[in-house]
């Protein structure tokens, strides 16, 4: 999916109002400096691409974050504010239902969510120096 035509300000508002807090809750008890940066993004569409990948694609050591509160709210925000996003996710969602597993918070998941926090921060506060 190409995130170029999303309403970035509305997604930013959703992040600030709820998603950021859910990420903090998930990470509670973990130091912010515990994990090295392993993913980045260079513009807002790129940030959303990486956020979607880390949030919804299973990885080794972290089978699924998709049922977490922050993930469901991320999905809702993208569905509402990115034209045509919902349609692209129907097949992916059906595949997810077949793979549903018990939720387990592993260290790998904590690391992954730490990376997500970094991506969201970059999306929210683009790296341009205020002149």
């Amino acid at each position: 999916y190409d995130f170029t035509n999303c309403d970035f300000e509305k997604i930013k508002a959703a992040y600030l109002s709820t998603i950021s807090k859910d990420l903090i809750t998930y990470m509670s008890g973990t130091k912010s400096t515990e994990f090295n940066n392993t993913v980045s993004c260079s513009n807002r569409p790129h940030c959303l691409t990486e956020i979607q990948s880390l949030t919804f694609n299973p990885t080794a050591g972290c089978a699924s974050l998709a049922k977490e509160m922050f993930a469901m709210k991320t999905k809702a925000a993208l569905a509402i504010w990115c034209p045509g996003y919902s349609e692209t996710q129907i097949n992916a969602t059906q595949a997810m239902k077949k793979r549903r597993k018990r939720k387990v918070t592993t260290n790998k998941c904590l690391e992954q969510v730490s990376q997500l926090q970094g991506l969201w921060r970059r999306f929210n506060r683009p790296l341009l120096k205020q002149q």
Partner: antibody, heavy 126, light 106 residues
Framework: QVQLVESGGGVVQPGRSLRLSCAAS????????IHWVRQAPGKGLEWVAV????????YYADSVKGRFTISRDNSKNTLYLQMNSLRAEDTAVYYC???????????????????WGQGTTVTVSS | SYELTQAPSVSVSPGQTASITCSGD??????ACWYQQKPGQSPVLVIY???KRPSGIPERFSGSNSGNTATLTISGTQAMDEADYYC?????????FGGGTKLTVL
């Protein structure tokens, strides 16, 4: 762990070509811009080139423009530097470095380099 | 083309504060960062976005950037801080490094 490893250096005659490689591991290579930086013996750091995360933007130092080409293969987590028409003044240790960047609709900005390789030595001599 | 100017060398006694400066036209309008390089080793990022410290860099390293000058400050300098220090910024499609400052801890 997060790592960059350069290879391909060696001794080459003036006017000849050489291709350097930089293998990345421990991070999502395809999400970062990557630089080549060199350091001549006893001298300071000199930036050579940078490529954006998806390869769509490439920038070069004036001293290598038209002679060097930066490229990447995200499927192989590898960065390359094709060096043609080499000169004695290209003799240096060549480092690849992971870069921070941002682009708006008008410009690309590259900032700091937070992970560096160990370097590979290129000697141009007859 | 854009240039960043650093003093070739700075000396400091152990425990004292070392200040290394980097000057360039309207440098304060850009993000500056600093690298430490010890002999035979690769550079290490010690300050980014003017004043932020990467994880693992001691608190004694700090940075500032305004006007035409960026400054790297090392408070309570230790012998292990002896190294070359380079400033760096981005200007119109080019990465620019300063010439480097050799910090000697007397």
């Amino acid at each position: 762990q997060v790592q960059l490893v350069e290879s391909g250096g060696g001794v080459v005659q003036p006017g000849r070509s050489l291709r350097l490689s930089c293998a990345a591991s421990g991070f999502i290579f395809s999400s970062y811009g990557i630089h080549w930086v060199r350091q001549a013996p006893g001298k300071g750091l000199e930036w050579v080139a940078v490529i954006s995360y998806d390869g769509s933007y490439k920038y070069y130092a004036d001293s290598v423009k038209g002679r060097f080409t930066i490229s990447r293969d995200n499927s192989k987590n590898t960065l390359y530097l094709q060096m043609n028409s080499l000169r004695a003044e290209d003799t240096a240790v060549y480092y690849c470095a992971r870069g921070d960047s941002w682009n708006d609709r008008l410009n690309y900005y590259f900032y700091d380099m937070d992970v560096w390789g160990q370097g590979t030595t290129v000697t141009v001599s007859s | 083309s854009y240039e960043l100017t650093q003093a070739p060398s700075v000396s400091v006694s152990p425990g004292q504060t070392a200040s290394i400066t980097c000057s360039g036209d309207k440098l304060g309008d850009k993000y500056a960062c600093w690298y430490q390089q010890k002999p035979g080793q690769s550079p290490v990022l010690v300050i980014y976005q003017d004043k932020k410290r990467p994880s693992g860099i001691p608190e004694r390293f700090s940075g500032s950037n305004s006007g035409n000058t960026a400054t790297l400050t090392i408070s309570g300098t230790q012998a292990m801080d002896e190294a070359d220090y380079y400033c760096q910024a981005w200007d119109s499609s080019t990465v620019v490094f300063g010439g480097g400052t050799k910090l000697t801890v007397l």
